[in-house]
Interface confidence: low
Amino acid sequence: GCLTQLYENAFFRGGDVASMYTPNAQYCQMRCTFHPRCLLFSFLPASSINDMEKRFGCFLKDSVTGTLPKVHRTGAVSGHSLKQCGHQISACHRDIYKGVDMRGVNFNVSKVSSVEECQKRCTSNIRCQFFSYATQTFHKAEYRNNCLLKYSPGGTPTAIKVLSNVESGFSLKPCALSEIGCHMNIFQHLAFSDVDVARVLTPDAFVCRTICTYHPNCLFFTFYTNVWKIESQRNVCLLKTSESGTPSSSTPQENTISGYSLLTCKRTLPEPCHSKIYPGVDFGGEELNVTFVKGVNVCQETCTKMIRCQFFTYSLLPEDCKEEKCKCFLRLSMDGSPTRIAYGTQGSSGYSLRLCNTGDNSVCTTKTSTRIVGGTNSSWGEWPWQVSLQVKLTAQRHLCGGSLIGHQWVLTAAHCFDGLPLQDVWRIYSGILNLSDITKDTPFSQIKEIIIHQNYKVSEGNHDIALIKLQAPLNYTEFQKPICLPSKGDTSTIYTNCWVTGWGFSKEKGEIQNILQKVNIPLVTNEECQKRYQDYKITQRMVCAGYKEGGKDACKGDSGGPLVCKHNGMWRLVGITSWGEGCARREQPGVYTKVAEYMDWILEKTQSSDGKAQMQSPA
């Protein structure tokens, strides 16, 4: 299953399959997730080791048992791959690293005014993988405001050095934010020239294209079909690159198919997995296990659940079957692709779905209506769980926020439905940033059921929580995916990085904002909060957040939206925007429904009809 916990001051011994430099443990974990053999990782921050060569070291590890012995190492961080973790699987990494220079091949330098502009340039350059930016206070004047675009053979820095007044980060192409655009065309009977960066076996050109998209240096590919004239080259997928970023030449060639990486697509990237099943095809590889199952789909499910399994073959040979069950061969290889592909067999083959975003584990549950003041504009995909709850009456207008917590579930505030309990007047917009982008053609979700907490009373602040079941499940994308829920009764975690988001008023007597706003707000103890609201009871099922001096807060229209906190690299839904005295007033924190206190209720209400929970708490 999905294991998200990180182990601090611990290092996994043995099992190494690869090593690289990464700026933090989260990026190391992402590289582990996308490595075909990696199940575990260990990361050495700069502060944890004196050996300059091992600083920022990211060590990817495999284990037949799924675990390795941990040794104590001060400062080290270890953890698990996020394979099987559904919506948490993403190659997108937005963080900017201050005081760090990520080294690589510098192929472009320009003067820019901010690190954000440098990151944008990298994202809009086809070859750029990461970048470094020298700030205005950099010690050498001639380098100030320099934006260095970089690449490396593996897509990760060749070294990482601590350097004052330098900021580094990665291209946001994996976040589907590139302005370049992409070529969806597949060119039949055409072979591309240029440099081969890798060679794998795939059953078709579409799998070849997805592998190219997630390979750090693949810009285009050529696939040789199973009827290609040279037998040893059949089903070969050649991943390619060039200096210019496009093929320098192409040759008409029977039984070849060529195309481009889809990494530069805007707004949608293909999932990093291959769900198609190939009848009459055998995939060869190292045997992991053989089990008897009923049907090829069950075989694929079995492979997906066995975390080390990469691909499978389901045999229908009479000697491989007994009664209704046949042998399911679970296999793996060094590069995650079959070592042999045979056609005209009595088998059916396919791949593990462990890297798909849309598994069943879709949710890790790891007095005046309020309202964001003092915030800034959000960017695409920054808060992909944020939804806009809108009412369609004479006109249509944003009314409340909400948080996507599953394919078919949204969590919001109960008071959003005061006087509006009819589900057919509501429209729920997900995967949006600008409200002005909504037109009559914008897809929206309709409500199947509104579940208001049984103890909620109109005009009271208590139990201000409601679940919305959508009429149809949503697919997950970089811009639309759920937020993890906290563990039941989560009281021990100290959250220091918390944000509130919404389209609400930017001042008490303001108006709804067009661009989703975000504001970083510290949590306030309930004791402190109670002092500020002596006329109200601040219960343990509430959480407060705000600055003593005011100036930053949720406001009207933010109600029901998320208060999220980042802990150990993972965002969790800590609160639901509920109420407050005015907006951003001095010594008047915002009051939020404490989600951890309602985990039993959420899990009970989201039970599916067959009794299986739609979400589970983090381990």
């Epitope: 004479t394 207008r397 509006l420 009819l422 037109t439 108006e511 067009n514």
Partner: antibody, heavy 120, light 107 residues
Framework: EVQLLESGGGLVQPGGSLRLSCAAS????????MTWVRQAPGKGLEWVSS????????IYADSVKGRFTISRDNSKNTLYLQMNSLRAEDTAVYYC?????????????WGQGTLVTVSS | DIQMTQSPSSLSASVGDRVTITCRAS??????LNWYQQKPGKAPKLLIY???SLQSGVPSRFSGSGSGTDFTLTISSLQPEDFATYYC?????????FGQGTKVEIK
Amino acid sequence: EVQLLESGGGLVQPGGSLRLSCAASGFTFSWYPMTWVRQAPGKGLEWVSSIGPSGGQTIYADSVKGRFTISRDNSKNTLYLQMNSLRAEDTAVYYCTTEYGDYGGGFDPWGQGTLVTVSS
Amino acid sequence: DIQMTQSPSSLSASVGDRVTITCRASQSISSYLNWYQQKPGKAPKLLIYAASSLQSGVPSRFSGSGSGTDFTLTISSLQPEDFATYYCQQSYSTPPTFGQGTKVEIK
């Protein structure tokens, strides 16, 4: 200050046409739905037509459907009502209004109105 | 369409009186009921929205109540500037519809 200012009213013969305009200021016009409401002399208020923020969604009262067209130019912060095939019963003061306040909170503010008289 | 019926259609009252106007919807409109005041030759002015919420800048002597089909506008102590015509309006469904109005005159 949020303001709406209608213009374009006047005397017109039955069967004739008229185009009313409503200039908006003091708020983000492109975000709000806009509405025309009319009031015949000595009578009550009657909703005429509404248009969505982007102009894509329009709705009309049965009494004007097929004859009146509501539109907006967000770049000019202006709302329009094109009135064709006018009848005597269309004689009224025409107000433009929006729902600038709280969600579902009724029509506010209103313009001062422009008088349309349909008479031969 | 939802019909809105106001009563009375007119009433006479004195300064300082408590005045109540009722509005009935032909079907349930939840709390989607708004009240307007209109003086001769002027545009309507929103007083109460969502049945009971006082519009910014409106004196607190005006109040609204009700939900479903029956609603009330109350002026707790009538002032000289309150003599006008009052309309209710539902914003629950399209088309929005108004009541026929209640004229409040000086006794």
